[in-house]
């Protein structure tokens, strides 16, 4: 309930918000949660923390984890997890769905796409944008202030849009980059009962003990823009909200609009340094619109490392 | 600059629900919480509760426990306080508050009548 | 709950003259914490939303003239208008900012003589 998912790439800055809030007065405590190690305050630290803010300047893969803030208070403490995972830098331009931030739609009189998490850094203007991985170049294209504005919006703009700025930390510079989906609102739709694509019924699904594992639900709706659509992830037939493990968040993924217009759904369950007994967890993709509710099962096998021997 | 401003005035009957918005601008929305006051006629201020903008966790004072229902959407800047079972003595001036040291910033208030 | 009392109920003050206002708690309004009073003080005009003029017993909202200050801890505080102008002419209110739920003062209506 009181935990949040963070993630960044290394070597980028990467500053993560307590879950709760409080009084600015309050003070924060924050620790790494695998060893009860304190998260020091001074900013000599590469990772610091500063109030509300954890700072990792700049981030690195091994900082992943879950990290504790408590908020203290006159009358209580208050308790939130941070859940940071830092991926290792892509080689290609594919940005993977664990990295991205919640999809926003567009139509030809709205078509602002904001840079996710920017307000939690000291950045200035102005703000670099890229789609699929290409510098964004031409009139239609207006960086203002933390989000860009495209004139005259078509199908083809649709799309991933990376932003990318510089965060400054007593003088030190960082970058960071953010990528979010970008789909154009078909006028003309219609709904169907919900085609779950990913993952497969029953399937079981290998993972490594002590490793991070993603599960993607992802379905489909119809066509255009859905009155009602959703796709979740559920833990023995419980909400993953009330079912109290941090380390398994779920997380909106990309909503998509394929050439064919149809209207999908993803949803990303990241389970944090998997254990045993995650193993017996019965994991439920659901998706349900105005149709009516799908869902399909999904198992954890461990999967066995491979065998070097000559 | 931050401002607050806040749904229009209602007049409800008694057992009906009233909902107000109360929407942000001028700084990040989830870095503070929201809480809601209310003002009757002649009478004290009265806190109703809060809510951690952030993750959607509210927080509600013992008087209101189930009748009210605060909510938030991030996307929209908003905060929502809904009071349901309406009563006479639920007549009052509404405020939203934003959360710090002190309450710094309020919203302008939505006069809730309840009257048969 | 934290109650709040406020004396007196209204108060009637020439001109250039000091107005004093009083708030008591039920509990001590200190957390040893940070040492800070959770503690503030607004004024209202009729119409108008609170205007928060101190917090933490004694800090001045920024904006706020230097005629208005607050004093006190624990349970017992103080708010001072060292020289009352005819705009100061407003209910106040102090309020505990310390522990839910949130508690106000009945408040004080200062007008002038």
């Known amino acids: 309930k009181f935990s949040k998912q963070s993630w960044g790439l290394e070597n980028e800055a990467l500053i993560v918000r307590c879950p709760r809030q409080g009084k600015p007065s309050y003070t924060v405590d924050w620790y790494y949660s695998q060893t009860n190690k304190s998260i020091p305050t001074q900013e000599r630290n590469r990772v610091f923390a500063s109030g509300q803010l954890l700072k990792f300047l700049p981030a690195a893969v091994a900082d992943s984890g879950i990290y504790t803030c408590i908020v203290r208070s006159p009358t209580f403490n208050r308790t939130g997890y941070a859940n940071v995972t830092i991926y290792k830098k892509q080689s290609d331009c594919n940005v993977p769905d664990y990295l991205m931030y919640s999809t926003v739609s567009g139509s030809e009189k709205n078509s602002k796409i904001y840079c996710p998490t920017i307000d939690l850094y000291n950045w200035t203007a102005p703000l670099e944008w890229f789609k699929n991985c290409q510098a964004l170049q031409g009139s239609r294209y207006r960086a203002h202030k933390s989000f860009l504005v495209i004139d005259n919006v078509m199908t083809e703009d649709a799309g991933d849009y990376t932003c990318k700025f510089i965060h400054n930390e007593n003088g030190a510079n960082y970058s960071v980059t953010a990528t979010r989906s970008f789909t154009v609102k078909d006028e003309q739709g219609f709904s169907l009962f919900p085609v779950i694509g990913a993952p497969a019924q029953n399937e079981i699904k290998e993972v490594e003990i002590g490793k991070n594992a993603n599960l993607t639900c992802s379905a489909c709706f119809g066509k255009g823009t859905q009155f009602l659509a959703a796709v979740l992830w559920q833990l023995n037939g419980t909400k993953i909200t009330d079912f109290g493990e941090p380390r398994i968040q779920q997380e909106e993924g990309q909503n998509q609009s394929f050439s064919n217009g149809l209207a999908c759904l993803d949803m990303v369950l990241r389970i944090a340094d998997v254990k045993e007994e995650d193993l017996l967890l019965q994991y439920d993709c659901l998706a349900l619109n105005l149709h009516g509710l799908r869902r399909h099962t999904v198992r954890l096998s461990r999967k066995n490392p491979i065998d070097h021997h000559s | 600059q931050v401002q607050l401003v806040q749904s229009g005035a209602e007049v409800k009957k008694p057992g009906a629900s009233v909902k107000v918005s109360c929407k942000a601008s001028?700084?990040?929305?989830?870095?503070?919480?929201m809480n809601w006051v209310r003002q009757a006629p002649g009478q004290r201020l009265e806190w109703m509760g809060w809510?951690?903008?952030?993750?959607?966790?509210?927080t509600y004072g013992d008087n209101f426990k189930g009748r009210v229902t605060i909510t938030r959407d991030t996307s929209a800047s908003t905060a929502y306080m809904e009071l349901s079972s309406l009563r006479s003595e639920d007549t009052a001036v509404y405020y939203c508050?934003?959360?710090?040291?002190?309450?710094?910033?309020w919203g302008q208030g939505t006069l809730v009548t309840v009257s048969s | 709950d934290i109650v709040m009392t406020q004396s007196p109920d209204s108060l009637a003050v020439s001109l250039g003259e000091r107005a004093t206002i009083n708030c008591k708690s039920s509990q001590s309004l200190l957390y040893s914490g940070n040492q800070n009073n959770y503690l503030a003080w607004y004024q209202q005009k009729p119409g108008q939303p609170p205007k928060l003029l101190i917090y933490g017993a004694s800090t001045r909202e920024s904006g706020v003239p230097d005629r208005f200050s607050g004093s006190g801890s624990g349970t017992d505080f103080t708010l001072t208008i060292s020289s009352l102008q005819a705009e100061d002419v407003a209910v106040y209110y102090c309020?505990?900012?310390?522990?839910?739920?949130?508690?106000f003062g009945g408040g004080t209506k200062v007008e002038i003589k």
């Open positions: 508050a934003r959360e710090g040291d002190g309450f710094a910033y």
């Open positions: 001028g700084y990040t929305f989830i870095n503070y919480g």
């Open positions: 309020q505990n900012d310390h522990s839910y739920p949130y508690t």
């Open positions: 809510i951690n903008t952030y993750i959607g966790e509210p």
